[in-house]
Interface confidence: low
């Protein structure tokens, strides 16, 4: 009679994280008697995967009853797969014997490759705000998947960024890896509503790419603009003096008016308008009873944003010369700032 | 004038090592992405490594990668190219050359230097 | 790496000749394709960035287009200064690659 031979038909079977992997083993003849055995990897280091006389294998299923006198198939299933299940498994015969059991014959190995998918991607950016014109940096890290194959892309809305690199590690084989990618952006005054996004694109994903995604509102600082004017109201020995701040992201804003270098009264930025590209617009005022002084007036609009250093704007207020044209600032209404005399 | 002026090429045996330089003028060195890309006698362009304009993030070919440093001192306007443990497929004719968008990537390059000829033979 | 491929290697060409040269990607590349010349002796020269953009003091009769994987470029009318090799080159993904070259040739 022929001599047994262990046959494994598959040489590799690729199954996605979670699923089952079936591994297919058949033998061509019963004799000699004894058990199989199904071990990842060959040599001394082998790892025993089942054994049909003994031991507690919950992950497999054989595919057949093995305990049937005339049953020649070895196949078995290992539920609930995951990257550290990747490696290459033989089946092995065994013949009887006393005390043990001796090693008969081994298939030729299956090779189980596990797709696993990315996790989704996280992206951060820079600990600190910094202004337009500046390069950042934002990172995206995805996690976990295999095999190493692994497409990103940057893009900052919608338009695609070539200024990255891009990392998967590790660089030898593993059960699964992870990528890593440093993209530059260059801001711009109207970044405080873009977006920047890393998108992942793997085999497992089937055409559906993951995106993680960073606000640059969070990453962005927009200096104020500051214009300083003058109009006269009421009556003709007022003057309302505006300091408007123009176009400054985020909100945080301190505004301090001064008179001749002295500090009159420091406010800050509650009720500000919404420009449509996210920046906020804020406007302060003075009344100032001219009649009340000889001298010129120097009055100087100092703003502190976002814990910057301030910023200032002065304005020479001449009492020899009222303004004789007639006008009206209905935005200062909406301030909350409080009408002041200089005394 | 905007001119990039590359030095240090020569005559150098395998395994050994030389540092290329290139001295730039004319425009604000520290406010562009500077580049190493060769060329093999007779062969095509081949990119060599890149660098940030404040030395942040630095990109190598593969072929180099852990071999060739690339750096730059924005205060002397000067980029450099350290090449160790050199190779026959090493000699090329070594051109520097400029990211053309201002704070941005090396996208495309303008200008570049004339070049300096490195050649590995023992 | 994304691959370029240019075609044809070389071309034999009259001066006031419409020339065309073309250069594929491996894989999308979006618009972030460049032209250099260079001519024997010399270093690179930008003609082209952006794959359609023309750089400063480059004659008009060079032209770029095409966007994804298949880009064009085109002098209208050759001029006997046109005479030399032309590379593209990617830059959306590290490693930045050149196409092999082509060639213009006087016939």
């Known amino acids: 009679e022929e001599e047994l031979q262990v046959i494994q038909p598959d040489k590799s079977v690729l199954v996605a994280a979670g699923e089952t992997a079936t591994l297919r083993c058949t033998a061509t003849s019963l004799i000699p008697v004894g058990p199989i055995q199904w071990f990842r990897g060959a040599g001394p280091g082998r790892e025993l995967i089942y054994n049909q006389k003994e031991g507690h294998f919950p992950r497999v299923t054989t595919v057949s009853d093995l305990t049937k006198r005339n049953n020649m198939d070895f196949s078995i299933r290992i539920g609930n797969i995951t990257p550290a299940d990747a490696g290459t498994y033989y089946c092995v015969k065994f013949r009887k014997g006393s005390p043990d059991d001796v090693e008969f014959k081994s298939g030729a190995g299956t090779e189980l490759s596990v797709r696993a998918k990315p996790s989704a991607p996280v992206v951060s950016g820079p600990a600190a705000r910094a202004t337009p014109q500046h390069t950042v940096s934002f990172t995206c890290e995805s996690h976990g998947f295999s095999p190493r194959d692994i497409t990103l892309k940057w893009f900052k809305n919608g338009n695609e960024l070539s200024d990255f690199q891009t990392n998967v590690d590790p660089v030898g084989e593993s059960v699964s890896y992870s990528i890593h990618s440093t993209a530059k952006v260059v801001l711009t005054r109207e970044d405080v509503h873009s977006q920047v996004i890393c998108e992942v694109a793997h085999v497992t994903l089937q055409g559906d790419p993951l995106r993680g995604t960073a606000n640059l509102s969070e990453t962005i600082r927009v200096p104020p603009t500051l214009e300083v004017t003058q109009q006269p109201v009421r009556a003709e020995n007022q003057v309302n003096v505006t300091c408007q701040v123009r176009k400054f992201y985020p909100q945080r804003l301190q505004l301090t008016w001064l008179e001749n270098g002295n500090v009159s009264r420091t406010e800050t930025a509650s009720t500000v308008t919404e420009n449509k590209d996210g920046t906020y617009n804020w406007m302060s005022w003075l009344l100032v009873n001219v009649s009340a002084h000889r001298d010129d007036v120097k009055l100087t609009c100092q703003v502190e944003h976002d814990g910057q250093p301030a910023v200032s704007k002065s304005h020479d207020l001449k009492v020899s010369a009222h303004p004789k044209e007639q006008g009206s600032n209905t935005a200062a209404e909406n301030t909350g700032s409080n009408e002041r005399n200089i005394y | 004038e905007v001119q990039l002026l590359e030095s240090g090429g020569g005559v150098v045996q395998p395994g050994r090592s030389l540092r290329l330089s290139c001295a730039a003028s004319?425009?604000?060195?520290?406010?562009?992405?500077m580049g190493w890309v060769r060329q093999a006698p007779g062969k095509g362009l081949e990119w060599v490594a890149v660098?940030?304009?404040?030395?942040?993030?630095?990109y190598y070919a593969d072929s180099v990668k852990g071999r060739f440093t690339i750096s730059r001192d924005n205060s002397k306007n000067t980029l450099y190219l350290q090449m160790n443990s050199l190779r026959a497929e090493d000699t090329a004719v070594y051109y520097c050359?400029?990211?053309?968008?201002?704070?941005?990537?090396?996208?495309?390059?303008?200008?570049w230097g004339q070049g300096t000829l490195v050649t590995v033979s023992s | 790496d994304i691959q370029m491929t240019q075609s044809p290697s070389s071309v034999s060409a009259s001066v006031g000749d419409r020339v065309t040269i073309t250069c594929r990607a491996s894989q999308g590349i979006s618009s972030w394709l460049a032209w250099y010349q260079q001519k024997p002796g010399k270093a690179p020269k930008l003609l082209i960035y952006?794959?359609?953009s023309l750089q400063s003091g480059v004659p008009s009769r060079f032209s770029g287009s095409g966007s994804g994987t298949d880009f064009t470029l085109t002098i209208s009318s050759l001029q006997p200064e046109d005479f030399a090799t032309y590379y593209c080159?990617?830059?959306?993904?590290?490693?930045?690659?050149f196409g092999g070259g082509t060639k213009v040739e006087i016939k």
């Open positions: 050359a400029t990211g053309r968008e201002t704070y941005s990537g090396p996208n495309w390059f303008d200008p």
């Open positions: 952006a794959a359609s």
């Open positions: 004319g425009f604000t060195f520290s406010s562009y992405a």
């Open positions: 660098i940030w304009v404040d030395g942040s993030l630095k």
């Open positions: 080159q990617q830059a959306i993904y590290f490693p930045i690659t």
